[in-house]
């Protein structure tokens, strides 16, 4: 299932980096977020919980990223006018189910005044 | 069609050790949490252990713990049971099983493990 | 740890008739919107099958006569038509936190 562009603010700056910010609904518990740069798996992150229903956090794809109980954000760093595209956050529900994919993501513009350590 | 086909059980004297495998297939095993279930001849169903998907977090039943230790290889898609320090009362058929997210999704047909002199 | 008891220890019910089982927990098994309660079926010489995950979500593949019920403490399995196939122990089991237990398991048999 492909949602198209994301209904929110995707991407914050801030000190030369991006904070690329993927939602999920609330009452998901079991998931797996990629964030896709064109078609290319940037990062990853998987929250799943055992029969003892302890919380498993896996990264494959390991960017900085930060949990929590509606979204994960990753963080790119040292932005330059390659970060330029278009960024997808791939998310794959697993539990509750039905399993479900959603595609949510947005063009992120590089201007000037957003770059890490320019020249003056 | 997932399967899982359990091995390793036996006769074993008391205090003697016994290695279980769960062969699996049909599945991305390194995507599951995996589990050992066991029920005493005649007697309900009594869960045993745990592991996560890559082996790094372990859960133990307050029974076992100290002396079961369980593993698993991801290359060979195998689930393991080490059973240290057995006792008359771990007589049981041990079911290898995945959590497939919110429940035990799929079980082996057992392993009879015999602990007697 | 959270103890599971069930009731009755065994029933006999004729064919076509219902059969209800009832599981209670120790402690609510409810969190947020989910009830971690789940039902195995157990025939004689076989390993469980998962029957009803989430208190009454059935498992696909599993017949419509199978239902569960319930919310926080109180559980309920029921066969609205047992049929000869479904003469089987069935179990409830928890995992709301470590350990996950079952209850001690309900024998049905036809009458």
């Known amino acids: 299932e492909i949602n198209g562009s994301a209904n929110y603010e995707m991407f914050i700056f801030h000190n030369g980096g991006v904070q690329i910010l993927c939602k999920y609904p609330d009452i998901v518990q079991q998931f797996k977020m990629q964030l896709l740069k064109g078609g290319q798996i940037l990062c990853d992150l998987t929250k799943t919980k055992g029969s003892g229903n302890t919380v498993s956090i896996k990264s494959l794809k390991f960017c900085h990223s930060q949990l929590s109980n509606n979204s994960v954000s990753f963080f790119l760093y040292n932005l330059d006018h390659s970060h330029a595209n278009y960024y997808f956050c791939n998310l794959s529900i697993f539990d509750p189910p039905p399993f479900k994919v959603t595609l949510t993501g947005g063009y992120l513009h590089i201007y000037e005044s957003q770059l890490c350590c320019q020249l003056k | 069609e997932v399967q899982l086909v359990e091995s390793g059980g036996g006769l074993v004297q008391p205090g003697g050790s016994l290695r279980l495998s769960c062969a699996a297939s049909g599945f991305t095993f390194s995507d599951y949490w995996m589990d050992w279930v066991r029920q005493a001849p005649g007697k309900g169903l009594v869960w045993v252990s745990n592991i996560d998907e890559d082996g790094s977090i372990a859960e133990y039943s307050p029974f076992v713990k100290g002396r079961f230790t369980i593993s698993r290889d991801n290359a060979k898609n195998t689930l393991y049971l080490q059973m240290n320090s057995l006792r008359a009362e771990d007589t049981a058929v041990y079911y290898c099983?995945?959590?497939?997210?919110?429940?035990?999704?799929?079980w082996g047909q057992g392993t009879l493990v015999t602990v007697s002199s | 740890d959270i103890v599971m008891t069930q009731s009755p220890d065994s029933l006999a019910v004729s064919l076509g008739e219902r059969a209800t089982i009832n599981c209670k927990s120790s402690q609510s098994l409810l969190s947020g919107s989910f009830n971690y309660l789940t039902w195995y079926q157990q025939k004689p010489g076989q390993p469980p099958k998962l029957l009803i995950f989430y208190a009454s979500t059935r498992q696909t593949g599993v017949p419509d006569r199978f239902s569960g019920s319930g919310s926080g403490t109180d559980f309920t399995l029921t066969i609205s038509s047992l049929q000869a196939e479904d003469v089987a122990v069935y179990y409830c089991h928890h995992h709301y936190n470590a350990p996950p237990t079952f209850g001690p398991g309900t024998k049905v048999d036809i009458k």
């Open positions: 099983s995945r959590w497939g997210r919110f429940a035990f999704d799929s």
